[in-house]
Interface confidence: medium
């Protein structure tokens, strides 16, 4: 057996997709310039990236949102990178907030999240936002991925 078979590259990069559901969990799709290296990582429910190998992973997300309300009356836009472990406990891995700094009809802002985390087989990661209706889904705006180190 070749070394590459024992330690295959595991990588995923998926693109945001608008959803009619009211859930705060962002929806993703294998479309455009996406990556899904092999079946050791899967996009499940259009919402979560699930890995089948234990190890250290770099996990990242970029969320672009439309700041389209008066800054004085608007709560901050918060994006969270969350982990759902096999025991079904959910936890927040990373979180970031941006104030709405533009009074224009749509002042584009973005949040970037990224970090290295140990994942167990069957662990899933997903992205939560406070207001999914403000997320921008155009090409290159909002994406999510991971890479096994």
């Amino acid at each position: 057996m070749q070394k590459g078979d024992q330690n295959p590259q595991i990588a995923a990069h998926v693109i945001s997709e608008a959803s009619s559901k009211t859930t705060s969990v962002l929806q993703w799709a294998e479309k455009g310039y996406y990556t899904m290296s092999n079946n050791l990582v899967t996009l499940e429910n259009g919402k979560q990236l699930t890995v089948k190998r234990q190890g250290l992973y770099y996990i990242y997300a970029q969320v672009t949102f439309c700041s389209n309300r008066e800054a004085s009356s608007q709560a901050p836009f918060i994006a969270s990178l969350c982990l759902k472990s096999p025991g079904r406990f959910e936890r927040i891995l990373l979180r970031a907030a941006n104030e709405h700094s533009s009074a224009k009809p749509c002042g584009q802002q973005y949040i970037k999240l990224g970090g290295v985390f140990e994942l167990q087989p069957g662990a899933s990661v997903f992205v939560n936002v406070t207001d999914p209706s403000q997320v921008s889904h155009g090409t290159g705006f909002t994406s999510f991925g991971l890479l096994k180190l």
Epitope: K21, T22, V25, N39, T42, E44, N45, K47, T50, G122
Partner: nanobody, 116 residues
Framework: EVQLLESGGGLVQPGGSLRLSCAAS????????MMWVRQAPGKGLEWVSS????????YYADSVKGRFTISRDNSKNTLYLQMNSLRAEDTAVYYC?????????WGHGTLVTVSS
């Protein structure tokens, strides 16, 4: 249109077995993690078990671990729950669902009654 249709419930004596089925349609079943939840009379919803999209990972609540087995047949778009060594406290309406939905695509459930 998304539809989930549970079946297989019924009256069974303590220590008995049942196999629940959930027929799914209207979405790409093989890409979705699925779960079983239950609601006992007068109580809230309780998560029972989950299974990954390809069936390689299964998770169970402590209350059913070792007695219940979740499985799926993606070629038939069907989710299963094999329930053994049933107890009175397993009496409930059982629902299959996709973990992220907010009750919009839930079926009507199937009633399991464990009684002597």
């Amino acid at each position: 249109e998304v539809q989930l249709l549970e079946s297989g419930g019924g009256l069974v004596q303590p220590g008995g077995s049942l196999r629940l089925s959930c027929a799914a349609s209207g979405f790409t079943f093989k890409k979705y993690e699925m779960m079983w939840v239950r609601q006992a009379p007068g109580k809230g919803l309780e998560w029972v078990s989950s299974i990954s999209s390809d069936g390689s990972f299964t998770y169970y609540a402590d209350s059913v671990k070792g007695r219940f087995t979740i499985s799926r047949d993606n070629s038939k778009n069907t989710l299963y729950l094999q329930m053994n060594s049933l107890r009175a406290e397993d009496t409930a309406v059982y629902y299959c669902a996709e973990p992220f939905t907010e009750f919009d695509y839930w079926g009507h459930g199937t009633l399991v009654t464990v009684s002597s």
